[in-house]
């Protein structure tokens, strides 16, 4: 790793190291020789999940019911909302941005693995 000018949880600005804002807070103003970094908590439905120097918090993900989504875990100031799919559907991507109906096994095939919230049914030919 290349050398860094600052400690962990600091950043370099105007040739000085300033403290990063803790998760759940955003940067209002950089530190100076005489003042510390100024941070403010994220607002309702916003979050920042790392030590940061962001001036804006990120919006929580919206679990769109029209896409078959529902809230699995409510977001906090330090974490994003986690979406999952409604009963009978599974996520189509790692980030679960949309859902698809579980695939039924066609005649001549049996269920080898049941579908879950994140995986589709795995079918297997009958012997």
């Amino acid at each position: 790793e290349p050398p860094t000018a600052c400690r962990e949880k600091q950043y370099l600005i105007n040739s000085q190291c300033c403290s990063l804002c803790q998760p759940g807070q955003k940067l209002v103003s950089d530190c100076t020789e005489f003042t510390e970094t100024e941070c403010l908590p994220c607002g309702e439905s916003e979050f920042l999940d790392t030590w940061n120097r962001e001036t804006h918090c990120h919006q929580h993900k919206y679990c769109d019911p029209n896409l078959g989504l529902r809230v699995q875990q409510k977001g906090t100031a330090e974490s994003d909302t986690v979406c999952t799919c409604k009963e009978g559907q599974h996520c189509t991507s790692k980030d679960c941005e949309a859902c698809a109906q579980h695939t039924p096994c066609i005649p001549g095939f049996g269920v080898m693995e049941m579908a879950t919230e994140t995986t589709d049914t795995v079918c297997h030919p009958c012997p």
Partner: antibody, heavy 126, light 107 residues
Amino acid sequence: QVQLVQSGAEVKKPGASVKVSCKASGYTFTGYYMHWVRQAPGQGLEWMGWINPDSGGTNYAQKFQGRVTMTRDTSISTAYMELNRLRSDDTAVYYCARDQPLGYCTNGVCSYFDYWGQGTLVTVSS
Amino acid sequence: DIQMTQSPSSVSASVGDRVTITCRASQGIYSWLAWYQQKPGKAPNLLIYTASTLQSGVPSRFSGSGSGTDFTLTISSLQPEDFATYYCQQANIFPLTFGGGTKVEIK
């Protein structure tokens, strides 16, 4: 009371490696960065880098990048500095030095060394 | 890297003298500066940090001043135990850098 006790003197051949230990006592080992500073005979002080014993994170001076490795064993409150591919100009006294407490610093890196090990003389000679 | 230049490199003085050592940084370091005393065969000893704060247990005859690029260590009345080498160190950004040292010798 705070103490940093280093391993004994070493004589090494050029191209070899040396590993110096620094055992801390009298304070919470994981609460303070540990730095390594060396001093060649009759010369000034030269900073080598730091390790955060809590996270294991390190930061090495460019000059030693790729040749130095700083590690720690929190179970025995000991920091280590390994220097590889030794040359004759690596002959020096190597010191570990304790920094200010984690979270103390808000502006600047404010790394001031209030406690030092007794030093370990490493002689590199063929 | 920030270069730290100390002057003089050596000074001859007598017990009771006032001794001043200067340290100049190649770029502004605010007040992030420390002074150490080192005696032969020993590890350095922290005297002053943040340019002017006296480390606990250090005699009040030692004082520090300055900010930005120019700093001073003053020993108001030199004592026999003060004959040693003194180093400044910037603590603004990594890599930490030290001055070349000032040896205070007996006149």
